[in-house]
């Protein structure tokens, strides 16, 4: 079964580029149509530091002791999210001559739709996940991963590409979203913030996590990325939130310990193969799923996003290493490399578990506002 195709006549009027400058196209939301989170201010009108809420203003969330101490997304307090202060900095871009889709950066010019028109699409990523509005889909079975435990040799390329750190994966890592929905893993990369500023791409009820891992997959129905771009289900990304825990994460340390070697933009090193599945949460049965896009140019749509409910814990030192080691172009740090959340424009996020059930004593009946569109598949 596959996520249903998004309707072209969705109730909201158009998509947001997620960039600093609002677009002039008629079908894009105006300031009053779009919450601040989804329509970040331009570079020239970014709020000053004194306007930004501090860490103490963010909802405090304590992890549960179960499941490796990982926080569950549905355990987050339901708060009305103010405009997200952690806007991506104007500091991470690649600038390779002759490669139009390399001429982009987080924040500022050029507007992404000028780099790739798909970035102005109506069904973009990332998005804000609201568990209460997610449609419970019993048909969404536990994810299946095969071949993700790699031997030390051959080694893998770990690269600072100027907008993230990317680990290129070898052939043979197979992932299934369900029967007949088979993929092979291509690469993984991370998104992060800066000191005291979270940097996940997806948010939950407006809450941004310290960091986020993306494992990018190509459908076995397609030979190449170029052929899969923009095709429904052609690409699939497994996403998990990273947050602070008391202990060092040994799986992540195998990568984080090598970041100093690739501090410079465009540099790379070889790292021993590792258990890629150890970088993900252990619970493959509870997740959110929706159809969106790549979160960087070319912003191609049709990407199936699977966001784990369980998070991954890294130590404070590890999160600091992630956000404070790499450099982008020039003399700028590679930080805050996340895109602003994009409007759903009528899309329904599906959940493999009853995420919208309110367990508080006041709730007489579980509340589920959206029904699963794929239940009959």
């Amino acid at each position: 079964q596959r996520l249903p195709r998004m309707q072209e006549d969705s109730p909201l009027g158009g998509g947001s580029s997620g960039e600093d400058d609002p677009l002039g196209e008629e079908d894009l939301p105006s300031e009053e149509d779009s919450p601040r989170e989804e329509d970040p201010p331009g570079e020239e009108d970014l709020p000053g530091e004194e306007d930004l809420p501090g860490e103490e203003d963010l909802p405090e969330v304590k992890p549960k002791s179960e499941e490796e101490g990982s926080l569950k997304l549905e355990d987050l307090p339901t708060v009305e999210a103010p405009g997200d202060p952690q806007e991506p900095q104007n500091n991470a871009h690649r600038d390779k001559e002759g490669d139009d889709q390399s001429h982009w950066r987080y924040g500022g010019d050029p507007p992404w739709p000028r780099v790739s028109p798909a970035c102005a699409g109506r069904f973009q990523s990332p998005v804000d996940i609201r568990p209460q509005l997610a449609a419970f889909c019993p048909a969404l079975r536990p994810l299946e991963l095969l071949g993700f435990q790699l031997p030390p040799l051959p080694e893998l390329r770990l690269r600072n590409n100027g907008h993230s750190v990317q680990l290129t994966l070898p052939p043979g890592l197979e992932m299934a979203l369900g029967p007949g929905r088979e993929y092979r893993a291509l690469q993984l990369h991370l998104h992060w913030g800066a000191a005291g500023r979270p940097g996940s791409e997806h948010t939950v009820e407006g809450h941004r996590f310290p960091a986020e891992i993306h494992v990018v997959h190509l459908s076995t129905a397609f030979a190449r990325v170029d052929e899969a771009l923009g095709r429904p289900g052609g690409l699939a990304v497994l996403a998990a939130f990273l947050e602070e825990g008391p202990e060092e994460n040994s799986a992540y340390e195998q990568l984080l310990s090598r970041l100093e070697e690739i501090a410079e933009e465009g540099s790379e090193t070889q790292v021993p193969g590792l258990d890629i599945s150890a970088l993900l949460p252990s619970d493959f049965s509870r997740y959110f799923q929706y159809e969106g896009s790549l979160t960087t140019p070319p912003c191609a749509q049709g990407v199936i996003w699977t966001v784990f409910n369980q998070t991954v814990m890294l130590s404070a030192k590890q999160l600091h290493t992630l956000s404070d080691t790499l450099w982008g172009p020039g003399d700028s740090r590679l930080q805050l490399n996340f895109r602003a959340t994009q409007p759903l424009n009528g899309r329904v996020i599906e959940a493999s578990f009853p995420a919208g059930v309110d367990s508080s004593p006041r709730a007489a009946e579980p509340v589920q506002l959206n029904s699963c569109l794929a239940a009959g598949d």
Epitope: G98, L156, R157, R159, N161, T168, P171, R224, E268
Partner: antibody
Framework: EVQLVESGGGLVQPGGSLRLSCAAS????????LIWVRQAPGKGLEWVSI???????YYADSVKGRFTISRDNAKNSLYLQMNSLRAEDTAVYYC????????????????????WGQGTLVTVSS | DIQMTQSPSSLSASVGDRVTITCQAS??????LSWYQQKPGKAPKLLIY???KLASGVPSRFSGSGSGTDFTLTISSLQCEDFATYYC?????????????FGGGTKVEIK
Amino acid sequence: EVQLVESGGGLVQPGGSLRLSCAASGFSLSRYTLIWVRQAPGKGLEWVSIIDSSSSAYYADSVKGRFTISRDNAKNSLYLQMNSLRAEDTAVYYCARDRVLSYDDYGDLPDGFDPWGQGTLVTVSS
Amino acid sequence: DIQMTQSPSSLSASVGDRVTITCQASQSISNYLSWYQQKPGKAPKLLIYAASKLASGVPSRFSGSGSGTDFTLTISSLQCEDFATYYCLGVYSISTDDGAAFGGGTKVEIK
């Protein structure tokens, strides 16, 4: 017409250097993974070097440290700088292009090379 | 390092024969395998990409199959113009040295 044309081959003494060029026409090579392949007289094809669209370069063990692959997107050309040449480097050298646009930032791998150049002969002999 | 083992190294066949050439990778390469035809004095020509997909302009008598480590090129009914040398190319990685390799080649001769 999409085309690759190699040049720069010739006779060189052992220990000498040579720079091969591969000029592209009919397409912009900047977004493609490119490869150099060689074929010694009467022998099979041997992969020499590859460069992805981020200009990361990789080599066969037999040429590592002696050969350097590079590209000039403005000139729409691929190069192979060959130093410390040996008799066993004598071969026809071909350049070839990944058949579709490369997305190496997405871990994309080439699954076929097309088109190919006509080849240029390098002879290393004293 | 990846190695590609191609067999047979040569074969004799007649027009109309069905010809099968195999290639084995030393480690799984999924479907990142291509087949090439080369005639004397000419550059290689792409026949099959992604293990089983026919390149543009290639006759349908050519087909490829396999995934992982074992691959096959089949010519269902050999024609005069098919007498040539055939090579497989496997790609395990382009982000490490020695991440790609050709098979040793199969020379298809007239019986």
